[in-house]
């Protein structure tokens, strides 16, 4: 605590500004204004990331206005140093006390590298499991933004369920944060809009994302399944392919079944929906099967879950590794696909 | 030009700095320093994006040092205004002349949202056209006065060919810059490494990307082609599907041919290579064909161009919309796929 017989200084750093195009000048001046103190000896030190800098302080100038004094000290930095994100501190010692102000290059204000995405529920979760969830995904965060806040709301103003949060470091040195919110099947189908608001002290403005049931025309998927013939050198393995196309909207879930049991998602690889030449979408799904599986039961089912499929939001197609001859003839003659 | 009987002012804007964590303060002060002029009447006006601002200038203070005067005028802005990327100008009228300095928020300096990618030549360009090119792609640039520089080099130190450059403004307001470099077929096949160096005034460090022929094991693609059966309501259209799999490395070109003529790439949709459960990759390609096409000639060819395919780096597979019965039987009996 300062004793009463002197007025302590205020320490404030000003900096040279960028030009009218927002470009950094080749050198950056930091001006340390030490103002409003009772005249007396003051000591100014500049620190870079906490380390004392070797700076010529003979340029510091002191002026007196009435009973109070002010001192200015200038530090010149190369653009490269300034852009390297170091912290600069002007430390003032006066009457045995220390006063300081610190600065660094302003954090990038445009969250260009920070993106937020809000998914819709998968048709499988919505129509089969009947426990739909939506996920708010925030990517390209720095580790210090791990405390990013994701808050949920509904356009109707009704309360939201409890959400679960996950944090993951990506291989490119960025952070991904997800928040998953369970939604009511009926609420979703009836067109409720859900909002995810992303805030963090370093983000100049909140990122808002909203999601609701897709509007527009509906079309049920066509499902076709194929088996590859035997390939030299791989007698005990075959690939099954499923083409699902001309569906609208693009939300779809694809499953493979064998022996009336759904195979784990990790077993197959399904592409992202892509636009057809018309107005619909298509996906391909690929499943590798073993001789043991097809010898146990040579029927595999590719199933699409989609809101426009009737009666139960699913369309499926069976395929065999070794189809009977008559099946082949039938299809060659252009019979209906099921 | 100023007459000799007065010294004109220097106009310089300083700004309040961000704190030691790089955070913007709630309000930003711009300080216009008008210094070193022969005492006389001066008029200070602040402009925002070229428009005169309604600012209380009574706070401007003038001091005299020896024979020259200095004046300071302060403008306080909300963080929101400052972050909205407007340009602020301190305009000084003195002895019938105008002197000014402009500033705006410094452009984001961290290339957080800036990514650079360097492609390898497509197998089609490399093996069929024999005129391979590589492309350096820089995305998520903020449009600004500083131009992005893409320079090419070879690890061997040998000279590079002349490159072509393209700039494209994306709908999200960012800039994409590409530079395409022709490379020697032999140089590439023999393992030359090419580097693309991306520099820009706003990037604190150059982005470097290098590319060379992929190392590791090789495997030729398996190619399978299928036609969908007729679907109710679309008698005059069919979809052909091509599954190309178990190839290594992942670089592949896919083409469709009809009547010995290659169809334009825009006609088909081919997925990005994805990993199989083993060590190889797979792609799917989808082509919509019309009755007019299959009635003219009912044979369509799916061709893969890949470095491991022999003898001529291509593997192809024919498919018909209405296959003859014997073709179908043959395949059902598990004959070799071609």
């Amino acid at each position: 605590v300062c004793s009463r017989d002197f007025t302590p200084p205020t320490v404030k750093i000003l900096q040279s500004s960028c030009d009218g195009g927002g470009h950094f000048p080749p050198t950056i001046q930091l001006l340390c204004l030490v103002s409003g103190y009772t005249p007396g000896t003051i000591n100014i030190t500049w620190l870079e990331d906490g380390q004392v800098m070797d700076v010529d302080l003979s340029t510091a100038s002191t002026t007196q206005e009435g009973e109070l004094a002010s001192t200015q000290s200038e530090l010149t930095l190369s653009q490269k140093h300034w852009l390297s994100d170091r912290t600069y501190t002007c430390q003032v010692t006066y009457q045995g006390h220390t006063f300081e102000d610190s600065t660094k290059k302003c954090a990038d204000s445009n969250p260009r590298g920070v993106s937020a995405y809000l998914s819709r529920p998968s048709p499988f979760d919505l129509f089969i499991r009947k426990s739909p969830t939506i996920t708010c995904l925030v990517v390209d965060l720095a580790p210090s933004k791990g405390t990013v806040n994701l808050t949920w709301s509904r356009a109707s103003g009704k309360p939201v369920n409890h959400s679960t949060r996950k944090e993951e470091k990506q291989r490119n040195g960025t952070l991904t944060v997800t928040s998953t919110l369970p939604v009511g099947t009926r609420d979703w189908i009836e067109g409720e809009t859900y909002q995810c608001r992303v805030t963090h002290p370093h983000l100049p403005r909140a990122l808002m994302r909203s999601t609701t049931k897709t509007s527009g025309p509906r079309a049920a998927p066509e499902v076709y399944a194929f088996a590859t013939p035997e390939w030299p050198g791989s007698r005990d393995k075959r690939t099954l392919a499923c083409l699902i196309q001309n569906f609208m909207p693009e939300d779809i879930s694809v499953q493979w079944l064998h022996n009336e049991v759904q195979l784990p998602d990790a077993r197959h690889s399904t592409t992202q929906p892509r636009k057809t030449k018309g107005s619909g979408f298509f996906v391909f799904s690929r499943l590798e099967v073993t001789r043991a599986e097809w010898e146990q039961k040579d029927e595999f089912i590719c199933r699409a879950v989609h809101e426009a499929a009737s009666p139960s939001q699913t369309v499926q197609r069976a395929v065999s590794v070794n189809p009977e001859l008559d099946v082949c003839v039938e299809e060659a003659e252009g019979e209906a696909p099921w | 030009v100023c007459s000799r009987d007065f010294t004109p002012p220097t106009v310089k804007i300083l700004q309040s700095s961000c704190d030691g964590g790089g955070h913007f303060p709630p309000t930003i002060q711009l300080l216009c320093l008008v210094s070193g002029y022969t005492p006389g009447t001066i008029n200070i006006t602040w402009l925002e994006d070229g428009q005169v601002m309604d600012v209380d200038l009574s706070t401007a203070s003038t001091t005299q040092e020896g024979e020259l005067a200095s004046t300071q005028s302060e403008l306080t802005l909300s963080q929101k205004h400052w972050l909205s990327d407007r340009t602020y100008t301190c305009q000084v009228t003195y002895q019938g002349h105008t002197f000014e300095d402009s500033t705006k928020k410094c452009a984001d300096s961290n290339p957080r949202g800036v990514s650079a990618y360097l492609s390898r030549p497509s197998p089609f360009d490399l093996f069929i056209r024999k005129s391979p090119t590589i492309t350096c792609l820089v995305v998520d640039l903020a449009p600004s006065k500083g131009t992005v520089n893409l320079t090419w080099s070879r690890a061997s130190g040998k000279p590079v060919n002349h490159s072509t450059r393209k700039e494209e403004k994306q709908r999200n307001g960012t800039l994409t810059v590409t530079s395409t470099l022709p490379v020697g077929t032999r140089d590439w096949i023999e393992g030359e490494t090419y580097q693309c160096r991306v520099t820009h005034p706003h990037l604190p460090r150059a982005l470097m990307r290098s590319t060379t022929k992929t190392s590791g094991p090789r495997a030729a693609p398996e190619v399978y082609a299928f036609a969908t059966p007729e679907w109710p309501g679309s008698r005059d259209k069919r979809t052909l599907a091509c599954l190309i799999q178990n190839f290594m490395p992942e670089d592949i070109s896919v083409q469709w041919l009809h009547n010995e003529v290659q169809l334009p790439d825009a006609r088909h949709s081919t997925t990005q290579p994805r990993k199989t459960k083993g060590s190889g990759f797979f792609v799917f390609s989808r082509l919509e064909v019309t009755r007019a096409e299959w009635e003219q000639k009912d044979e369509f060819i799916c061709r893969a161009v890949h470095e491991a395919a022999s003898p001529s780096q291509t593997v192809q597979r024919a498919v018909s919309v209405n296959p003859e019965l014997d073709v179908c039987v043959e395949e059902a009996e598990g004959e070799a796929p071609w």
Epitope: S144, R171 | A116
Partner: antibody, heavy 119, light 111 residues
Framework: QVQLQQSGAELAKPGASVMLSCKAS????????MHWVKQRPGQDLEWIGY????????EYNQKFKDKATLTADESSNTAYIELSSLTSDDSAVYYC????????????WGQGTLVTVSA | DIVLTQSPASLAVSLGQRATISCKAS??????????MNWYHQKPGQPPKLLIY???NLDSGIPARFSGSGSGTDFTLNIHPVEEEDAATYYC?????????FGGGTKLEIK
């Protein structure tokens, strides 16, 4: 300048636990991931795991999941690794290393702490 | 886990000559246009020091006689011309997949 100052050498008995520290200075501690790496005498380097000091979120190499516990204290700019149920296989030099945002490498390392496990 | 195999295990090179160290990965360390391979060297009693990141980028302050190349599974570190101070153990590191792994090291001796 950036510095990662690690605590001194430890001699521990089999079955015991040790806590090693890594004090960061010269930069904003919570802006970077802190990783730990093990190096047995005359052997190669093994990645143990990392912590995000801001959130305390950790990821481990499965091999060290039951061996190491990573923590961080933002107020003292210090990261810690606790090694439990020590055996002679845990005798090694342990390094802390800093990973930056958008970087997937270690530009800064601590000087290392030698842990010797002996009866 | 991705296994990195370095060769040779040790290497003796005359002053001013070229040293070449190879690192082979058990699977590709490329992802989405980037290569997640780094090189470090380590002198006795010291921590490793970053030389090259992302396969071919020289870290600041590292002399230009060091260079890295490669993509996918095969990578090379070259030092030319070799100087006395380059005597050290060299490690490659992949950061494409958890757990991050290091090569077994190559000990460089100057003749």
């Amino acid at each position: 300048q950036v510095q990662l100052q690690q605590s001194g050498a430890e001699l521990a008995k089999p079955g015991a636990s040790v806590m090693l520290s890594c004090k960061a200075s010269g930069y904003t501690f919570n802006g970077y991931w802190m990783h730990w790496v093990k190096q047995r005498p005359g052997q190669d380097l093994e990645w143990i795991g990392y912590i995000n000091p801001t959130t305390g979120h950790t990821e481990y190499n499965q091999k060290f999941k039951d061996k190491a516990t990573l923590t961080a204290d933002e107020s003292s700019n210090t990261a810690y690794i606790e090694l439990s149920s020590l055996t002679s296989d845990d005798s090694a030099v342990y390094y802390c290393a800093r990973q930056e945002y958008r970087h997937s490498w270690f530009a800064y390392w601590g000087q290392g702490t030698l842990v010797t496990v002996s009866a | 886990d991705i296994v990195l195999t370095q060769s040779p295990a040790s290497l003796a090179v005359s002053l001013g000559q070229r040293a070449t160290i190879s690192c082979k990965a058990s699977q590709s360390v490329d992802y989405d246009g980037d290569t997640y391979m780094n090189w470090y060297h380590q002198k006795p009693g010291q921590p490793p020091k970053l030389l090259i990141y992302a396969a071919s980028n020289l870290d600041s302050g590292i002399p230009a006689r060091f260079s890295g190349s490669g993509s996918g599974t095969d990578f090379t570190l070259n030092i030319h011309p070799v100087e006395e101070e380059d005597a050290a153990t060299y490690y490659c590191q992949q950061t494409n997949e958890d757990p991050w792994t290091f090569g077994g090291g190559t000990k460089l001796e100057i003749k």
